[in-house]
Interface confidence: medium
């Protein structure tokens, strides 16, 4: 495939990445799948600058990001190292809370209404943000 040089329609460019902000809600897995079908991934926050950009666009609304611990340790969906990377959890989070009564703990991370992160039940229907890098090869065939 060819390298993407500009963002798709309705996506927003920032620092060589393209972002798409949903206005409806889905469970984390459905949001993850939606982004993959768009040749993208749920947003991976690697800096405070990127955090500010994303939260400026989402406003004070719970919104999924590409961070989960469904298999044990916290992992970013694109393989970015969690331990050494940027973090912005709310105080006392993540807490893998079991008291919600929905079964299990909390395995998926989202932006809260002040921008900082919380872990929550992955089935909750939150908005989401997709991200794709401009410099990566597109899955579309090259134009001849």
């Amino acid at each position: 495939g060819s390298e993407r040089t500009c963002c798709p329609v309705n996506w927003v460019e920032h620092e060589r990445s393209c972002y798409w902000f949903s206005r409806s809600g889905k469970a984390w897995a459905d949001a993850d799948n939606y982004c993959r079908l768009e040749d993208a991934h749920l947003v991976v926050v690697t800096s405070w600058e990127e955090q500010k950009f994303v939260q400026h666009h989402i406003g004070p609304v719970n919104t999924w990001m590409g961070l989960h611990d469904q298999n044990g340790p916290w992992k970013w969906v694109d393989g970015t190292d969690y331990e050494t990377g940027f973090k912005n959890w709310r105080p006392e989070q993540p807490d893998d809370w079991y008291g919600h009564g929905l079964g299990g703990g909390e395995d998926c991370a989202h932006f809260t209404d002040d921008g900082r992160w919380n872990d929550d039940v992955c089935q909750r229907p939150y908005r989401w943000v997709c991200e794709t890098e401009l410099d990566k090869a597109s899955q579309e065939p090259p134009l001849l």
Partner: antibody
Amino acid sequence: QVQLQQSGPGLVKPSQTLSLTCAISGDSVSSNSAAWNWIRQSPSRGLEWLGRTYYRSKWYNDYAVSVKSRITFNPDTSKNQFSLRLNSVTPEDTAVYYCARDRYNWNYPYWYFDLWGRGTLVTVSS
Amino acid sequence: QSVLTQPPSVSGAPGQRVTISCTGSSSNIGAGFEVHWYQQLPGTAPKLLIYGNSNRPSGVPDRFSGSKSGTSASLAITGLQAEDEADYYCQSYDSSLSGYVFGTGTKVTVL
């Protein structure tokens, strides 16, 4: 003009509870773009953030790790004020206590204190 | 105690330029969180001097300027004046503490 007016006793006995109140004029304790903080200052610890209370569709409290087990904030919308309770005080808690506002909006999410109360010297001594 | 480190004191003659450093770590300044500066005159509450690394609130003279690089920040005072004699504190946010952190404070003396 926004002002923060602090009140509370200046002397507290060891093991008792320190209680301070900060009355807000010209702004709202339940503002969606502000948070209301307590900060203390002593020669031994310097400036130390104790925590904050703020409203974003519901009330939140953030507490500093160093005092988390002993501290409680209580916002009062009817009086437009917020209070601090610090339990089981020791002489180490002797300090000037300030209330302060931090501003936060989505276009400009910098966290800083743009407004301070005048401070209350609290001495912990028997 | 304080997470951000500043020199205890700096001094300069009137008209000179002095700088105050503020050193943090990868979970505060190094993570990209903005640095803010406060001036505290004797017997008064701290007053916001610089916010967002380099922005001055209205009413603050342009003799005061701030900058940030890596895990540290600095405050510069040019054309030092007698009324600048005060304590200066840096402040940021720390993601590992999920809270605000202050510098150790620097006393500026005008000779």
